[in-house]
Structures are given as C-alpha cells and as structure tokens.
C-alpha cells in the first residue's frame, strides 16, 4: 500500500487560475499539432488494475517521465506557455518526491512503461501528443493526489 500521507498534493496547487489556464492553453496548442488522434496516453489502460490509493503514485511516475523525457527536450517549443508550465509541474514533482509505495508496484510500472513505449515509438509526434495531453495529466494528477 502507498505511504498515503506522502502521496498527496494540497488542493491549493490546483487552485491557481493563471497557471491552470496556461497549462490548458499549452495542451490546446500542442494538440492542434497532434495528427494522431487514435491514440490516448492518459486513459483507461494507464490506470487498469490500479487501486484508488495507488493512483497518485502512478501519476507521479507519469509526471516525472513527462518532465524528463518530453517537456525538458521540447522546452524551446510552444512558448510562452512552456516556460511557465514546466517550472510549475516540476514543483509538483518535487512535492511528490517522498511518495512511494510499500510492496509490489510491478503492475504500476508495467502500465507506465506502456505509456513510455507508446511515446518513444511515436518519436517526436509522441512527445507532441504528451504535451497535448497536459490538461489530462493536470486533471488526473489533481484527482489522484488531492
């Protein structure tokens, strides 16, 4: 089971209209450049077999991957949104640094790995798709962690 007290984000992190709006604007702009609408990264398959108490830990993994493998490499694109949204998401990642789960997290790692594999397989268009789903990442992170 997760060390649930550490797998929590305060509601106030998601009650900042300006950065929420910028995150959604960034997602909107990137989704216009996404020509692969058949694939969804953040959806039912990602959460399959994951209990309520494990969702935040899973989303922490997705957030960290998105930052390190997608947003940092693409940081020169989609300005001015990117330069505001990335530090915000990085702060959330930092706040979840002590979120771990005790015991087996293989099912979670397997689900996250499928997402990573999909992004990698699609190459740059996979990275654009991930940016285009930042609204879903934001909302899923909120719903899982508050």
């Amino acid at each position: 089971a997760p060390i649930s007290s550490h797998c929590r984000l305060d509601k106030s992190n998601f009650q900042q209209p300006y950065i929420t709006n910028r995150t959604f604007m960034l997602a909107k702009e990137a989704s216009l450049a996404d020509n692969n609408t058949d694939v969804r990264l953040i959806g039912e398959k990602l959460f399959h077999g994951v209990s309520m108490s494990e969702r935040c830990y899973l989303m922490k993994q997705v957030l960290n991957f998105t930052l390190e493998e997608v947003l940092f490499p693409q940081s020169d694109r989609f300005q001015p949104y990117m330069q505001e949204v990335v530090p915000f998401l990085a702060r959330l990642s930092n706040r979840l640094s002590t979120c771990h789960i005790e015991g087996d997290d293989l099912h979670i790692q397997r689900n996250v790995q499928k997402l990573k594999d999909t992004v990698k397989k699609l190459g740059e268009s996979g990275e654009i798709k991930a940016i285009g789903e930042l609204d879903l990442l934001f909302m899923s992170l909120r719903n899982a962690c508050i």
Epitope: A1, M52, S53, M139, S140, A144, I146
Partner: antibody, heavy 119, light 112 residues
Framework: EVQLVESGGGLVQPGGSLRLSCAVS????????MIWVRQAPGKGLEWIGI???????YYASWAKGRFTISRDSSKNTLYLQMNSLRAEDTAVYYC?????????????WGQGTLVTVSS | AVVLTQSPSSLSASVGDRVTITCQAS??????LAWYQQKPGKAPKLLIY???TLASGVPSRFSGSGSGTDFTLTISSLQPEDFATYYC??????????????FGGGTKVEIK
C-alpha cells in the same frame, strides 16, 4: 462482451434484509472498482457506494451502517447487503463498473433489479 | 457535498431540433463531469466524460462543454432514439469519499 446482471430483488417487509447480486462477465472484478446506484420510482439516480480494486469500500453518508458492498472474485460476483430496510429504500438497484480514466466514469451498467419494501 | 442542478427538468422537442441541457454545480468541479442517457425501463448509458469527451460508440450529434460550475449537453439534431432522460454526474475529489459521486436531478426530453 462485458455484461453485468443483477439479481436478488423482490418484495421485502420493512425492517427486513436483502442481498442483491451482480454477476459480471467479460472482465475481472479484481481489476475494476464497482459501484451500486439506486433509482426510486420516477426519481433520479442516487449513488450508494463503491468497492475498490483492493477491496476497500466507501459509502454515501446515508447508506453507512445499513448497506454493505462485498465481492467474490472467484465467482466474479458483486454483492449489496441491505439491512433494516424502509419504504423509502424501494427502488431499482443498479451495479456498474467504475472505469478510472483520470476521472471516475461508470460504464457499463447492469439492467437493474427492483426492490420493493412494503408490508 | 456538491449539488448538481439540471435545467430544464423536462422539455418537448421535435425530431431535427437542436436541444441544450444545462447542469450547474454548487462548487468548482473543474471538468469532472459526465453525462448519461436513460431510456424508460433501461439502465443509464455513458455519453460524455471529462465534460466534453464523447464515449465510445456515441453519435457525434451529442456534445458536451463547460468547466468549473457550468456545463452543457447539446444534441445538434434530435433523433427518434434520443427521447430519454439525461443525467449529469460529478466526481469531487479531496473531500470525504462519502460525497465523491453526485448525480443531477435529470432532464426528460419528450416528443412535441
């Protein structure tokens, strides 16, 4: 094909008990949270409670103490135990699968089973 | 607990009409809203989630919009099979789990 079939409804006297069943096929109960929802005649939908993948249960405040959700994963069957039944518990009772996609969505639903509480 | 107020509670329309149903939440629910269709004697069926994402197999004449406290379900051109009752449903996280899921009172769409 995913299917949910409720059973166990019927006429029960006030103060009585009833156990409803929801037999599922096409997916494993151990991989999804499941909910119970009820609908009084001519009224709207009312959430009763949920059983999570790990077996944790959560109930609407009004249902706590009288209603208990459980499951038997080996039989792929969900249950709703209802005690101290009242006339106002008369309703169609539905089970539904909870698909978390970043937000909880209920899909699909069973066809429902009617519970009538009357003397 | 969040309260969802649907309006109108019922409406009469003709085949081909554009129909709009609103759902107002008593607090900010972001985009954590779904819409369900229920025909008489049948179980509810998921239409829309994330306020605007069409569920699999749902015709494109259905659309959803809104965020925060105000949401809309639109049927662009009403078909005979669309006469039913429509419910909005919210998920509220971060509070007690006993009030996480709430349904609106429903909107009955009848034949004019």
């Amino acid at each position: 094909e995913v299917q949910l079939v409720e059973s166990g409804g019927g006429l029960v006297q006030p103060g009585g008990s009833l156990r409803l069943s929801c037999a599922v096929s096409g997916f494993s109960l151990s991989s999804y949270a499941m909910i119970w929802v009820r609908q009084a005649p001519g009224k709207g939908l009312e959430w009763i409670g949920i059983i999570d993948i790990d077996g944790s249960t959560y109930y609407a405040s009004w249902a706590k103490g009288r209603f208990t959700i459980s499951r038997d994963s080996s039989k792929n069957t969900l249950y709703l135990q209802m005690n101290s039944l009242r006339a106002e518990d008369t309703a169609v009772y539905y089970c539904a699968r909870d698909r978390f996609v970043g937000v909880d969505i209920f899909d699909p639903w069973g066809q429902g089973t009617l519970v009538t509480v009357s003397s | 607990a969040v309260v969802l107020t649907q309006s109108p509670s019922s409406l009469s329309a003709s085949v081909g009409d554009r129909v709009t149903i609103t759902c107002q939440a008593s607090e900010d629910i972001y985009t954590n809203l779904a819409w369900y269709q229920q025909k008489p004697g049948k179980a509810p069926k998921l239409l829309i989630y994330w306020a605007s994402t069409l569920a699999s197999g749902v015709p494109s004449r259905f659309s959803g919009s809104g965020s925060g406290t105000d949401f809309t379900l639109t049927i662009s051109s009403l078909q005979p099979e669309d006469f039913a009752t429509y419910y909005c449903q919210a998920c509220v996280y971060g509070n007690s789990a006993d009030s996480r899921y709430t349904f609106g009172g429903g909107t009955k769409v009848e034949i004019k």
